[in-house]
């Protein structure tokens, strides 16, 4: 008779990363016995669902049970059907759906109560799906990669396993950029958190942390480029925006009604002559920088100091890790080496900006035209940000890494939000246990 | 189902809080509107507490009113320096633009009088 | 402040007849569709008949059409039936989560 392997003593969990531009899927997978070591929950899959995000089908919620069905059908192939009822799923939205909320509670709980049905409808233990906040976003996205740095381990290593370790318990600060978003979370260096709002205290694995954090709202790469349309719109003697944040060449029409569609740009909204304008390429990076740092109002602080908009940042402290769109974007010009100064970015960016349209839709045949158009403000908006709105330095930039994934598993708040969900962060260093037969493999 | 509870003959310049019983549903997962009817007029919208507990009030409102979440299973509005203009029947809704079947309470009276 | 003006305050009807009536807004609903219809009869809340401007709310007889978008919107009763006479009301959802609800139409049934 054939040896049966004895089944894996694993355990597994999905959490759906509702953001503005995009749903993705993440399966997580650990092993039982190993549920409060820390660093052992893995990601085994991503799958992203096509389409736009979720507070896109505001005027289609009928849709939305199809825009899942891919996702939820490969989840159920990865994890196995015996797993399926305990496999927790758990939906958490972003930026997209906060903005929604804001126009409309009533379209938002709608479109979230579509999501609940369609996803209660499959066989997996499904927990509910909500609109996390800013701060919450901030929070697990610095758990996630501390988690998987393996910075909340007692146990000091002689070796290295994963990038960027220091071989310290120094944590690493999480730097979050989404359509809609983006958060800035570390810990300060015995430093006052100012503003409550801005502060959170965890005790994890018997440490405690007081950590730092903020969510800026309408200042992800999407809608920081809606709010630069807007309020360069204002000022434009006719319905043609020249404008030096896209390529020299490139040609876009822009419906008045889209720009001032969020509440992003309520507050530069004003009645325009043309109901449409269009927005023609110069390809200047100075150009562009300046405009995008009028979008960070840094003449009123009520603290000893600010990021923008009066909001508190103390003093930067350690390293970071820069990840989702801080990531794909630098990631796709080709900048995320340890190796590249800020300079040496500002230069490439210079260079890469006022490269005309036709040769850059030539260079990049495989990249589809609406994202590719964007890279030039996308990358500009990256510095701006750090630089002026965070107040990195052209000697503080060594200390960004940015990160796609750790380990395998994706650097992003999905993680962070299942670990604390599950209960699989103690709050106390677990009792060391005598060794089981899968200590060692 | 949403029942409204509260309403009573009250002096002007009182101050009276309105409960909203909700069952079958979660709070956290819904928005409760109060809405008005001075006997005789129309209705007039008050405001909303969204599952999130965030407050939205009409014009009007502001400042006077306030929408609280008090329990996992109530809502309170309430109504300060009362004048005979607020004499009306008082609803709590579930949802305001899609309140559907059962999402309305039978309304609860408030006469304001000396 | 956003204004709905509902006409006309009150209308007359036979039995089998058609009634229409008309809300106007001061500016845009949401989506351009976020308006909802009720129906009030005495001492009773308010009953939904139509959202989004012309889906039907289930139970809700298809004698009942609502049509229009972003500021003009009509609600058309046809084959009019006694049990029909009743106040109408609009209400409009608005960005930043404004509400504001029509004056009334008082419908009489001949």
């Known amino acids: 008779t054939q040896n049966k392997a004895l089944p894996e003593n694993v355990k597994y969990g999905i959490v759906l990363d509702a953001g503005s531009s995009h749903t993705s899927l993440y399966i997580y997978k650990w092993p039982a016995e190993k549920e409060n070591d820390t660093g052992v929950v893995h990601q085994v899959e991503e799958c992203r669902v096509k389409g736009p995000g979720i507070s896109k089908f505001v005027q289609k919620v009928n849709e939305i049970g199809i825009y899942l069905t891919d996702c939820m059908e490969r989840a159920r192939e990865v994890i196995p059907r015996s797993q399926h009822q305990e496999t927790p799923v758990y939906l958490g939205a972003t930026a997209g759906m906060r903005l929604l909320r804001m126009e409309s509670e009533e379209l938002a709980d709608r479109v979230l109560d579509v999501v609940e049905r369609s996803l209660s409808n499959y066989p997996f233990d499904f927990q509910g799906a909500r609109i996390i906040t800013g701060q919450e976003e901030g929070a697990y996205g610095w758990i996630t990669i501390n988690y998987l740095l393996g910075k909340f381990s007692q146990k000091t290593r002689w070796f290295s396993i994963v990038p960027y370790e220091t071989n310290n318990q120094e944590t690493f600060g999480a730097l979050d950029l989404g359509g809609a978003s983006t958060q800035v979370t570390f810990v300060p260096q015995n430093q006052t958190i100012e503003s409550p709002d801005n502060a959170l205290q965890f005790r994890l694995y018997g440490k405690d942390y007081n950590v730092y954090t903020h969510s800026f709202l309408c200042y992800g790469k999407d809608q920081a480029l809606w709010q630069k349309l807007a309020k360069d719109i204002q000022v434009a003697s006719n319905e043609i925006l020249r404008d030096p944040c896209f390529h020299p060449g490139y040609k876009k029409v822009v419906n008045v009604s889209d720009l001032y569609k969020t509440p992003c740009t309520k507050r530069f909204e004003m009645t325009l002559p043309f109901q449409q304008f269009e927005i023609q390429g110069i390809g200047n990076y100075q150009q562009c920088h300046q405009s995008i740092l009028e979008l960070f109002n840094t003449s009123y602080c009520p603290y000893s100091q600010c990021a923008f908009n009066g909001i508190f940042l103390p003093p930067l402290q350690g390293d970071f890790g820069a990840f989702s769109a801080f990531y794909f974007v630098m990631k796709f010009l080709n900048l995320t080496s340890e190796k590249v100064s800020q300079e040496k970015v500002t230069e490439m960016m210079k260079k890469f900006c006022a490269q005309p349209w036709e040769e850059i839709k030539t260079s990049y045949a495989g990249v589809k035209e609406k994202y590719l158009s964007e890279y030039c403000f996308s990358g500009t908006y990256i510095l701006s940000l750090l630089l002026q709105g965070y107040h990195f330095t052209a000697d503080s930039w060594e200390h960004i890494h940015f990160i796609g994934k750790i380990q395998g598993s994706d650097a992003g708040w999905t993680l962070g939000y299942m670990l604390n969900l599950t209960n699989m962060i103690p709050a106390e260093q677990p009792l060391s246990t005598p060794l089981s037969h899968s200590t060692y493999v | 189902s949403v029942e409204e509870s509260g309403g009573r003959l009250v002096t002007p310049g009182t101050h009276l809080t309105l409960t909203c019983t909700v069952s079958g549903f979660s709070l956290s997962k819904s928005i409760i509107s109060w809405v008005r009817q001075a006997p005789g007029k129309g209705l007039e919208y008050i405001g909303i507490i969204g599952s999130s507990g965030s407050t939205y009030y009409a014009n009007w409102a502001k400042g006077r009113f306030t929408i609280s979440k008090t329990s996992s299973t109530t809502v309170d509005l309430r109504m300060t320096s009362l004048t005979p203009e607020d004499t009306a029947t008082y609803f709590c809704a579930r949802g305001l633009l899609y309140s559907g079947n059962k999402s309305w309470g039978p309304g609860t009276l408030v006469t304001v009088s000396s | 402040a956003i204004d709905m003006t509902q006409t006309p305050s009150s209308v007359s009807a036979a039995v089998g007849g058609t009634v229409t009536i008309n809300c106007q807004s001061s500016?845009?609903?949401?989506?351009?569709?976020?308006l909802s219809w009720f129906q009030q009869k005495p001492g009773q809340p308010p009953k939904l008949l139509i959202y989004?401007?012309?889906t039907l709310e289930s139970g809700v007889p298809s004698r009942f059409t609502g049509s229009g978008s972003g500021t003009q919107f009509t609600l058309t009763i046809s084959d009019l039936e006694c049990d029909d006479a009743a106040t109408y009301y609009c209400?409009?959802?608005?960005?930043?989560?404004?509400?504001?609800f029509g004056g009334g139409t008082e419908v009489l049934v001949k």
């Open positions: 500016q845009s609903v949401l989506l351009n569709n976020q």
């Open positions: 989004d401007a012309s």
């Open positions: 209400l409009g959802g608005y960005s930043g989560n404004l509400y504001a």
